[in-house]
Amino acid sequence: ELCDDDPPKITHATFKAVAYKEGTMLNCECKRGFRRIKSGSPYMLCTGNSSHSSWDNQCQCTSSAARNTTKQVTPQPEEQKERKTTEMQSQMQLADQVSLPGHCREPPPWENEATERIYHFVVGQTVYYQCVQGYRALHRGPAESVCKMTHGKTRWTQPQLICTGETEPSQFPGEEEPQASPDGLPESETSRLVTTTDFRIQTEVAATMETFIFTTEYQ
C-alpha cells in the first residue's frame, strides 16, 4: 500500500530513510540535458524474498542530444564536483545502513542522475529527521515519522522535533552519536502537543496515490 502523502515538514530540518521497505519505488530521473534511455525502466523497485531485498531495474540516463546512443557524456568540471559529492555521500550512507529484513539500502547514484530523488513510499516506512546546519534539536520524543494506515487511510506520524538556535546539526541514526531523546510523554498527550495548533490532520492533501509523489533532496 503506497503512502498517499509526504512526511511532515519540520522547519529547519531535513529527513531521510535509513532503509526502504519492499514496495518502495524510486523514479529514474535524469539531470538537465539528459533523459532516461528509451528501453529503460521509469523507476526502480525495492523487491525481495525472505532472505534478501534489492532494487529491481537500473536507472540509466543518456544525453538528450545523443538520440540514438547510450554513450555517456563526460561531465563538465562543475558536474564532476557535484557527482563526486553525491558518490561520497552515498557511500557514507551505505556504510551507515544496517541490513533490515524486508528493506533495501539507499540505491547508489547512477550516471547523470538528477539532484532530486523522487520516492514513492509504502505503509510502514520510517524516515528520520535532523536539524539543518546551524540549528539544534529540541526533542519531545523520537525525531522520526512513520507512514501508517488506520481507518483505511494512510498518513505520517508527527515527528517530535523542533529545530532552534545556532549550533551543530543533530545526526541521523547510524551517523556518529545519535542524540538521546528525553523520555517522551504518552502518545495520547504528545500527539496533542506536537504542533502549535490543535491539529490532528497535519498537512492533509486531497490526492490519490496514483498522482502523489514524494520528493527528497539528494545532493
Epitope: K148, M149, T150, H151, G152, E187, S188, E189, S191, R192, T197, D198, F199, R200, I201, E204, V205, A206
Partner: antibody, heavy 118, light 106 residues
Framework: QVQLVQSGAEVKKPGASLKVSCKAS????????MHWVRQAPGQGLEWMGW????????RYAQKFQGRVTVTRDTSISTAYMELSRLRSDDTAVYYC???????????WGQGTMVIVSS | DIQMTQSPSTLSASVGDRVTITCRAS??????LAWYQQKPGKAPKLLIY???SLESGVPSRFSGSESGTEFTLTISSLQPDDFATYYC????????FGQGTKVEIK
Amino acid sequence: QVQLVQSGAEVKKPGASLKVSCKASGYTFTGYYMHWVRQAPGQGLEWMGWINSNSGDKRYAQKFQGRVTVTRDTSISTAYMELSRLRSDDTAVYYCAREGAGDAFDFWGQGTMVIVSS
Amino acid sequence: DIQMTQSPSTLSASVGDRVTITCRASQSISSWLAWYQQKPGKAPKLLIYKASSLESGVPSRFSGSESGTEFTLTISSLQPDDFATYYCQQYNSYSTFGQGTKVEIK
C-alpha cells in the same frame, strides 16, 4: 471543552432520505477526521464512514456505498451524514465521532435517534 | 472485511472481581485496536487505544494487551460504575467493531 452536538430525533418513512448534523466546538474542526457510526436497537456498533474535515476527502463502508453521503461546512464547524432510500432496518441511533490522537474515537456526539416506519 | 470476534457476549461478575474480555481479529491489525465502554442510552466512551494505551482520564484499573491477533481488556478490580457493555474496534482497515460484551452484576 470538546463537544459534538447532533441534531434531534427523526421519524422517517421508507424510501425517504435522512440528514443528521454534528456541530463541533472546543477544538479546531478542520484538524480532525469525523466518523459516523450507527447502532440499531439492542445491537452493536456499525461504522459508516469518515470525512477529512480539512480537505473534504471521504470514505464509506462497503455496505453503505451509494446510499450514504458525508459532507462538512467548515464555516460553521459542522459535519453532516445523509442516508438515502431508507428502510426499516435503518432504524438506529446515529453517532458522529471525532478521530483523536490515538486514531480511535475520543469524542462522540450524543446520538440521533432515527425511526424508519410506514 | 476484517471480522472482530468478541467473547464472552455476557459476563456476570461481582464488585472487586478481575474481569477479562477478549477480542480476536480475523487477520493482522498491527496494534490498531480500541476498547469502548457504553452505558444504556449513552454514547460509547473510549477506554483504550492502540491495544494498550490508556485514554486520558480513564482509571488505571482498565488495561489492554495483545498477543498476535488476540486482544484483551482487563478490569483489575471491578467497580459499581463498570457494569456496562464493552466493545472492541479494529481500525487498521476500515473500522469494524466486536459484537459487544455485557458485564452484569452476578
